[in-house]
């Protein structure tokens, strides 16, 4: 198997989780 | 300096199974929303499964071509996150990045599925 | 589920101009707590995608403040106001508002 490793070049050491809704639904379907 | 190391990737025959590991490190790990994406060239990026943190009861998501073949888990005394993939499909073939809720992310293990 | 669309599908930029790429949704991504979560994200030639933008215009730590974002509901916009030769590579917009979380197809940055 192949591991690989990345590195970001973001200073904060907490990960954002603030991309994303905290408490998502689905997609209304159009 | 956060690094997030991603492995277990390769070839895999349609049907088959393969489990993916992601270790964190750097980075305050139990707190973090934890994502699988995958990239091909058929499908560019494309959202696989999430998983969150304690506070929000470790609740999973996926995306509807996974589900009920693809399981999301997380190891909080370890720093790691798994996909574990079973009855793959040529469609399921790409690089698998492990992202933590789309902030930092690996570089990424390649799954080629392929008879 | 929400269509991210991407408009031009590649540019070609002289280093030290502007650059502009939009971003149209097929749904309104604004979520209910008033927030909307549109991000922006590089991926440089051989290397895995990298965070620039989260909840439409608020910069990640450590990103060049000639990148902004802007829009709203369903359109979106990521600007460089002058490009460098580290920009260039594939820019994608992605929906974090309903699930599944959606990308766009990605605009090329060309360097001039």
């Known amino acids: 198997s192949e591991t690989t490793t990345g590195t970001s070049s973001n200073s904060s050491q907490s990960t954002s989780n603030s991309g994303l809704a905290p408490n998502p639904t689905n997609a209304t379907t159009k | 300096e956060v690094k997030f190391e991603e492995s277990g990737g390769g070839l895999v025959q349609p049907g088959g199974s393969i489990k993916l590991s992601c270790a964190a490190s750097?980075?305050?790990?139990?707190?973090?929303?934890m994502d699988w994406v995958r990239q091909s060239p058929e499908k560019g990026l494309e959202w696989v499964a999430e998983?969150?943190?304690?506070?929000?009861?470790?609740?999973?998501y996926y995306a509807e071509s996974v589900k009920g073949r693809f399981t999301i888990s997380r190891d909080d005394s370890k720093g790691r996150v798994y996909l574990q993939m079973n009855n793959l499909r040529t469609e399921d073939t790409g690089i698998y990045y492990c992202?933590?809720?789309?902030?930092?992310w690996g570089q990424g293990t390649s799954v080629t599925v392929s008879s | 589920d929400i269509v991210m669309t991407q408009t031009p599908l590649s540019l070609s930029v002289t280093i030290g101009q502007p650059a502009s790429i939009s971003c149209k949704s097929s749904?309104?991504?604004?979520?209910?707590?008033?927030?909307?979560?549109l991000n922006w994200l590089q991926q440089r030639p051989g290397q895995s995608p990298k965070r620039l933008i989260y909840q439409v215009s608020k910069l990640d730590p450590g990103i060049p403040d000639r990148f902004s974002g802007s829009g709203s509901e369903t359109d979106f916009t990521l600007k460089i106001s002058r490009v460098e030769a580290e920009d260039l590579g594939i820019y994608y917009c992605?929906?974090?508002?309903?699930?599944?979380?959606?990308f766009g197809g990605g605009t090329k940055l060309e360097i001039k």
């Open positions: 750097g980075v305050t790990f139990s707190e973090a929303w």
């Open positions: 992202t933590g809720a789309m902030d930092y």
């Open positions: 992605m929906q974090g508002s309903s699930l599944p979380w959606t």
């Open positions: 998983i969150r943190d304690k506070t929000k009861n470790y609740v999973t």
């Open positions: 749904q309104s991504l604004l979520y209910s707590n008033g927030k909307t979560y």
